[in-house]
């Protein structure tokens, strides 16, 4: 359930605060990498590799680091100020409407269509009609209609952190 809450979900109204690390809150807020103590008088550091906070905040605890699922690779580890960045393995992608899992990219386009976009960690291959150039709906084609192609190489890492 760690993915259910990010600091964006919990973020209070953003207030400007001086950008230096302090052991006591500045204007009631603690710097990234810290949370506020129960009595509101101290800033307590998050535990490296366990939890984090990304903004100046008055959260009473740090947020849990995301653990990359099987089928994902860790692009960058969790630090006290940044959540783990996970990315789908080559040949798989994560859609916006189903962010909880990586799905296999299609291996090719349906008959009468050409591939114009490779498989990336955040998108399936993109197909368009040969004549009209209009995009395919994204439905997985029947096997016998498939024109095979190899999955593309990720163009750039996709940050999924909060």
């Amino acid at each position: 359930e760690s993915a259910l809450i990010t600091q964006q979900d919990l973020a209070p109204q953003q207030r400007a605060a001086p950008q230096q690390k302090r052991s006591s809150p500045s204007e009631g807020l603690c710097p990234p990498g810290h949370h506020i103590s129960e009595d509101g008088r101290d800033c307590i550091s998050c535990k490296y590799g366990q939890d984090y906070s990304t903004h100046w905040n008055d959260l009473l605890f740090c947020l849990r680091c995301t653990r990359c699922d099987s089928g994902e690779v860790e692009l960058s580890p969790c630090t006290t100020t940044r959540n783990t960045v996970c990315q789908c393995e080559e040949g798989t992608f994560r859609e916006e409407d189903s962010p909880e899992m990586c799905r296999k990219c299609r291996t090719g386009c349906p008959r009468g269509m050409v591939k114009v976009g490779d498989c990336t960690p955040w998108s399936d291959i993109e197909c368009v009609h040969k004549e009209s150039g209009t995009k395919h709906s994204g439905e997985v084609p029947a096997v016998e209609e498939t024109v095979t192609s190899s999955p593309g190489t990720p163009a750039s890492p996709c940050s999924l952190s909060g």
């Epitope: 359930e1 979900d9 809150p25």
Partner: antibody, heavy 122, light 112 residues
Framework: EVQLVQSGAEVKKPGASVKVSCKAS????????MNWMKQSPGKSLEWIGR????????FYNQKFKGKATLTVDKSTSTAHMELSSLRSEDTAVYFC???????????????WGQGTLVTVSS | DIVMTQSPLSLPVTPGEPASISCRSS???????????LHWYLQKPGQSPQLLIY???NRFSGVPDRFSGSGSGTDFTLKISRVEAEDVGVYYC?????????FGPGTKVEIK
């Protein structure tokens, strides 16, 4: 609509334990602390402590450490408070109440359960 | 622990008339961050408490504007501009500046 629905009244003998529950609905259960308060007959309110459903942390009023144990079942969005080694002075109505995860807005309870009367009598 | 006191402990009121409840704390409730964490609740007969005012003067959603809170330091006041029959019950002040959070003894408001 935010609702906190508590379990029914209990009658227990001295030395026994009791577990009171508080089922939350109408909001993200892991998005708020769940607090517990005690109201002795004809008396004021005392804050017992709170549970963080997000990470499992508890924070107790020192007075109730060893007396109350707070837990939750995230699968049913239910908070529990177990009171052990019951004595007559534990006879009270116990309330659950929701509070925010932030210091600045976390010290008051915006929604309360209806209360559970626990009677300790031999 | 911070001790909260309220006065009066019992307050007979006439509908349509104003009412005022005082709350005092044994120490200042001004936090080092500059905010004051003093709140008011109403417990109607046979019900659970309900939040009226938070942080001295902020009305909780749905609370009628006849309720107002004021004060600073150790002295606070809840005012009802025109009491209605539905306002009867016990009013509690509460502080969350200092751990543990504590409540006042309550003020019972009843119709004369």
């Amino acid at each position: 609509e935010v609702q906190l629905v508590q379990s029914g009244a209990e009658v227990k003998k001295p030395g026994a334990s009791v577990k009171v529950s508080c089922k939350a609905s109408g909001y993200s259960f892991i998005g708020y602390f769940m607090n517990w308060m005690k109201q002795s007959p004809g008396k004021s309110l005392e804050w017992i402590g709170r549970f963080n459903p997000y990470n499992g942390d508890t924070f107790y009023n020192q007075k109730f450490k060893g007396k109350a144990t707070l837990t939750v079942d995230k699968s049913t969005s239910t908070a529990h408070m177990e009171l052990s080694s019951l004595r007559s002075e534990d006879t009270a109505v116990y309330f659950c109440g929701r509070s925010a995860y932030y210091f600045d807005s976390g010290g008051y309870f915006d929604y309360w359960g209806q209360g559970t009367l626990v009677t300790v009598s031999s | 622990d911070i001790v909260m006191t309220q006065s009066p402990l019992s307050l007979p009121v006439t509908p349509g008339e104003p009412a005022s409840i005082s709350c005092r704390s044994s120490q200042s409730l001004v936090h080092s961050n500059g905010n004051t964490y003093l709140h008011w609740y109403l417990q109607k007969p046979g019900q659970s408490p309900q939040l009226l005012i938070y942080k001295v003067s902020n009305r909780f959603s749905g609370v009628p504007d006849r309720f107002s809170g004021s004060g600073s330091g150790t002295d606070f006041t809840l005012k009802i501009s025109r009491v209605e029959a539905e306002d009867v019950g016990v009013y509690y002040c509460s502080q969350s500046t200092h751990v543990p959070w504590t409540f006042g003894p309550g003020t019972k408001v009843e119709i004369k």
